[in-house]
């Protein structure tokens, strides 16, 4: 019986530890996509509607803030699209990029952790164009560090929650 009690306590401890594991999945807020034709920071994301969820991390001022030291898996998926009903592209040669950036407040510094993308030729003869970028990686993050997303050509972003999103989840503690 003692072994059973110990086992259930162990399960509970494991489960509460799992429940405390930080994670976030943030989806683009389509009502507030910034304008610009060069690299801009995306600061408006949902954290609590649709597929978006956050736990033991903080979303503030457009940045995902780490609350616990650890090794995290970071990911971002960005979709760009253009349909002729919205008008014409002013240029057919495009650089479609995403940058995942880490900012440290304690030692003021900023680093690009991941970038992805391509130069594209989107011909005016086509009715519809689409391009998707997915980046992901494993990083050591400290409490207080902030993760943000920058993209080129935000006016071409696909605003759907299954198209443009980013997130993080803690994989293990720092030894």
């Amino acid at each position: 019986e003692k072994a059973m009690v110990d086992g259930s306590w162990l399960d509970l401890a494991k489960r509460s530890k799992l429940e405390a594991q930080p994670f976030a999945h943030l989806t683009i807020n389509a009502t507030d996509i910034p304008s610009g034709s060069h690299k801009v920071s995306l600061s408006s994301w949902y954290h609590d509607r649709g597929w978006a969820k956050i736990s033991n991390m903080t979303f503030s001022n457009g940045k995902l803030i780490v609350n616990q030291d650890g090794f995290y898996y970071l990911y971002a998926n960005i979709c760009f699209r253009h349909h002729e009903t919205s008008g014409d592209l002013a240029t057919e040669y495009l650089q479609l990029m995403v940058y995942v950036t880490k900012t440290s407040i304690k030692i003021p510094s900023s680093h690009t952790l991941m970038k992805g993308g391509s130069t594209k030729y989107w011909s005016g003869n086509s009715e519809f164009h689409f391009y998707s970028i997915n980046v992901g990686g494993f990083f050591k993050l400290r409490s207080g560090e902030e993760i943000s997303i920058e993209v080129s050509n935000p006016s071409l972003l696909d605003p759907d929650q299954d198209a443009t999103y980013f997130g993080a989840f803690k994989v293990r503690d720092i030894d």
Epitope: S37, E84, T85, S86, A90, N153
Partner: antibody, heavy 126, light 103 residues
């Protein structure tokens, strides 16, 4: 304030060419596209083409492809539309119009014509 | 190629009347629809963009509605200065125009 001032009326014989100018003022010419639209007597407005004043990129209606050239002089903040091999059906009022989309804000030419020139009457007659 | 069709082609109304002009697209164009006012010898004027947004400086008696393939321009109280031809437009395609006159 934003203004587009076009050149004066022109009369041409069939087979000739005409070049209409459109001088912009009151805004940063290079940050916007200029469209050319015409209206023949008793007809609807007809889009002809656009030029991105910043990079010189152009797009034309299939109908005018091969007969139309649109250029710009950024130093003079002026766009030009030349139509060749004129025929009587080309008799119309030709307008230039600014696209509302600022190329610094994004790269989509949205076809919102927020400012127009006063129009240039081109008459093609033998 | 998208075709825009306006109705009626002309109308006559009294000052103060509510006037409605309809524009249909041959396929769905979301809300990418603009309305212009054209007076003889004058530069055309953008009234409504994006189906329902009032262009700066345009009197509030003008309003636009609709999405998909059917759109409406409404003048809530017709004024003498509203005598003109009105055109709907989606990117490269214009409607054939509606001539508005005073009774």
């Amino acid at each position: 304030q934003v203004q587009l001032v076009q050149s004066g009326a022109e009369v041409r014989k069939p087979g000739a060419s005409v070049k209409v100018s459109c001088k912009a003022s009151g805004y940063d010419f290079s940050n916007y596209a200029i469209h050319w639209v015409r209206q023949a007597p008793g007809q609807r407005l007809e889009w002809m083409g656009w030029i991105n004043a910043g990079n010189g990129n152009t797009k034309f209606s299939q109908k005018f492809q091969g007969r139309i050239t649109v250029t710009r002089d950024t130093a003079a903040s002026t766009a030009y539309m030349e139509l060749r091999s004129l025929r009587s059906e080309d008799t119309a009022v030709y307008y230039c119009a600014r696209d509302e989309s600022n190329m610094v804000r994004g790269i989509i030419i949205a076809y919102y014509f927020d400012y127009w020139g006063q129009g240039t009457l081109v008459t093609v007659s033998s | 190629e998208i075709v825009m069709t306006q109705s009626p082609s002309s109308l006559s109304a009294s000052v103060g009347d509510r006037v409605t002009i309809t524009c249909r697209a041959s396929q769905s164009i979301s809300r990418y629809l603009n309305w212009y006012q054209l007076k003889p010898g004058k530069a055309p004027r953008l009234l409504i963009y994006g189906a329902s947004s009032l262009q700066s400086g345009v009197p509030s008696r003008f309003s636009g509605s609709g999405s998909g393939a059917e759109f409406t321009l409404t003048i809530s109280s017709l004024q003498p200065e509203d005598i003109a031809t009105y055109y709907c437009q989606h990117t490269r395609a214009f409607g054939q125009g509606t001539k508005v006159e005073i009774k």
